[in-house]
Interface confidence: medium
């Protein structure tokens, strides 16, 4: 969903996380059990460099289950 070099920062990052994770909520840093690069948070990964939808979704809370 991103072009090369595009980044998400500040309010746009929060806005987009609220949208992508709308059914779950989100974290600014991944829970340690799910972290691949534990020293990094979403700001570093998506604002300081470009990130993609798959990476954004790793910051969503536990996936929702339908009833």
């Amino acid at each position: 969903a991103y072009g090369p070099g595009e980044t998400l920062c500040g309010g746009e990052l929060v806005d987009t996380l609220q949208f992508v994770c709308s059914d779950r909520g989100f974290y600014f840093s991944r829970p340690s059990s799910r972290a691949n690069r534990r020293s990094r948070g979403i700001v570093e990964e998506c604002c300081f460099r470009s990130c993609d939808l798959a990476l954004l979704e790793t910051y969503c809370a536990t996936p929702a289950k339908s009833e």
Epitope: L8, E12, D15, S22, D23
Partner: antibody, heavy 115, light 105 residues
């Protein structure tokens, strides 16, 4: 006051293309994410696509992924939806809606896909 | 996939109170804000309630929203003929199936 005006709908054959526009006024356009939401005749609302306020992120419903492209021109206060490879099931009224809460909607533009 | 379930239809007489439910799983309705939209016949949807219970300016206080557990509800008191419409709940990009409100008489 906030106003969203869609245009570009019409009759198109299956496999064809259309480009919808949504002209915005009455608010700070570049501060709001925007979405397209559609409603098939006699049916409920279905979110189609989203674009963040600077255009850095775009998202799509599975039903249109790979066929539709959302974009925005922040110098013209205009939102677009390029629709390719149209199918009969894409027939609907298409609305543009503001923000993540969809707090304002346009009047809609009808897209009919039929041979 | 997330599913938000609404009754297809509800009805009430003028002046009565009606409620419309929106049911989902604890991980969506229980965690996230629910919004409600009103769609009068032949018109575009309009935001009626946002963030579970907040009313945008211009929406009468006859309309109220609440959330408890895995359900959200829209209540309309002092029902009027002009309230006859379709009502949708949503969690951002996911909409319920809609409820048609009929005002009797």
């Amino acid at each position: 006051q906030v106003e969203l005006v869609e245009s570009g709908g019409g009759l198109v054959q299956p496999g064809g293309s259309l480009r919808l526009s949504c002209a915005a006024s009455g608010f700070t356009w570049s501060s709001f994410a925007m979405s397209w939401v559609r409603q098939a005749p006699g049916k409920g609302l279905e979110w189609v696509s989203y674009i963040s306020y600077l255009g850095s992120y775009t998202g799509y419903a599975d039903s249109v992924k790979g066929r539709f492209t959302i974009s925005r021109d922040n110098s013209k206060n205009t939102l677009y939806l390029q629709m390719n490879s149209l199918r009969a099931e894409d027939t609907a009224v298409y609305y543009c809606a503001r923000g993540t809460k969809f707090d304002y909607w346009g009047q809609g533009t009808l897209v009919t896909v039929s041979s | 996939d997330i599913v938000l379930t609404q009754p297809p239809s509800v009805s009430g007489a003028p002046g009565q109170r009606v409620t419309i439910s929106c049911t989902g799983s604890s991980s969506n309705i229980g965690t996230y804000d629910v919004h409600w939209y009103q769609q009068l016949p032949g018109t575009a949807p309009k935001l009626l309630i946002y963030s579970n219970s907040k009313r945008p300016s211009g929406v009468p206080d006859r309309f109220s929203g609440s959330k408890s557990g895995t359900s959200a509800s829209l209540a309309i008191t002092g029902l009027q003929s002009e309230d006859e419409a379709d009502y949708y709940c949503s969690i951002t990009r996911v909409f319920g199936g809609g409820t048609k409100l009929t005002v009797l008489g």
